[in-house]
């Protein structure tokens, strides 16, 4: 029985040129990650594999930091990048735990930070 | 196609070391984890750990760890067990194996569908 | 570490045989098992990764069942190819194989 709870950075907003920082948190759980992937819409961004470390994608690798943590850095933003995240925990043996941040990339300078929220 | 093939053969003394290679073929290095399995003479498959192509990083079976190295070379497509401190129950044939799913597909890693041919060595006084 | 305990370690079947061999985790590894056939003198070969999925190329009188502890590979119409030891696999951090299964003709 999956138990556990994926708390995430939850709707944010950054300026462009910009970086933000995604973070997901898996709690209440005592299930072992094997591996975190960071996915774009369909795009791997990055994983996390709990033997091998960070590995980039070679696509991203000029614009996406690993970490802090299992998190990822996006840096020198563009418009393009407004959208859906997911941060997808593969653990065992719960199986799969996903986390959803929908980040906007403002031209404005008036980016807010968004609320936490979580997904069970 | 795609391929692993290892070094030849090699005999050694107790207490030396072995370098055993695994050039790769076929695809692009750096996106797959190569394993190490080995295998004593009438005996089953033993995992020795495995090494990323992409960042070198390595996790090596708690039984090896500190006689055991793991490194790639990827300008040559070349993957490299050495073992160091070598006794008679370190006989067995060496297996390179690349992982089934490249690090880009998103899955979890882990199973081998591309094995090299294997090296023997034999430890011997 | 996780061990694999895999029976029976050996057994004795006909040509056109329904073949089953199970594999026991000492703790639960979800999905993450794999199972291998070899050959004397030869490298292993992938049949089944991930439980229950056929790796490309193998044909599909291999099968796999299974989740947490219990995991079973069946070969649904034994052929004289599949003379053979199989081991099982599992990937959770740190791998480890079982002890194998030699399947001999009766």
């Known amino acids: 029985m999956m138990t556990g709870t994926i708390e995430t950075t939850g709707n944010i907003s950054a300026e462009k040129g910009g970086s933000i920082i995604l973070q997901c948190h898996l709690s209440s759980t005592t299930a072992q990650v094997t591996q975190v992937n960071w996915e774009q819409q369909d795009q791997l961004l990055a994983i996390c594999n709990a033997d091998l470390g960070w590995h980039i994608s070679p696509s991203f690798k000029d614009r996406v930091a690993p970490g802090p943590g299992l998190g990822l850095t996006l840096q020198s933003l563009t418009v393009n990048d407004t959208g859906e995240y997911f941060c997808i925990y593969h653990t065992y043996p719960d199986g799969t735990y996903t986390g959803r941040i929908f980040l906007e990339v403002l031209e404005s300078s008036v980016a807010e930070h968004g609320a936490r929220f979580q997904i069970p | 196609q795609v391929q692993l093939v290892q070094s030849g053969a090699e005999v050694k003394k107790p207490g030396a070391s072995v370098k055993v290679s695994c050039k790769a073929s076929g695809y692009t290095f750096t996106s797959y984890p190569i394993g190490w399995v080995r295998q004593a003479p009438g005996q089953g498959l033993e995992w020795m750990g495995w090494?990323?192509?992409?960042?070198?990083?390595?996790n090596y079976a708690q039984k090896l760890q500190g006689r055991v190295t793991m490194t790639t070379d990827t300008s040559t497509s070349t993957a490299y067990m050495e073992l160091r401190s070598l006794r008679s129950d370190d006989t067995a044939v060496y297996y390179c194996?690349?992982?089934?799913?490249?690090?880009?597909?998103?899955?979890?890693?882990?199973?081998?569908?591309?094995w090299g041919q294997g090296t023997m060595v034999t430890v011997s006084s | 570490d996780i061990q694999m305990t895999q029976s029976p370690s050996s057994l004795s079947a006909s040509v056109g045989d329904r073949v089953t061999i199970t594999c026991r985790a000492s703790q639960s590894i979800s999905s993450y098992l794999n199972w291998y056939q070899q050959k004397p003198g030869k490298a292993p070969k992938l049949l089944i990764y991930?439980?229950?999925s056929l790796q490309s190329g193998v044909p599909s009188r291999f099968s796999g069942s299974g989740s947490g502890t219990d995991f079973t590979l069946t070969i649904s119409s034994l052929q004289p190819e599949d003379f053979a030891t199989y081991y099982c696999q599992q990937s959770v951090p740190p791998r480890t194989f079982g002890g194998g299964t030699k399947v001999e003709i009766k």
């Open positions: 991930a439980a229950s």
């Open positions: 090494i990323s192509s992409y960042n070198g990083n390595t």
């Open positions: 194996a690349r992982d089934l799913k490249s690090f880009w597909s998103g899955d979890v890693l882990g199973a081998f569908d591309i």
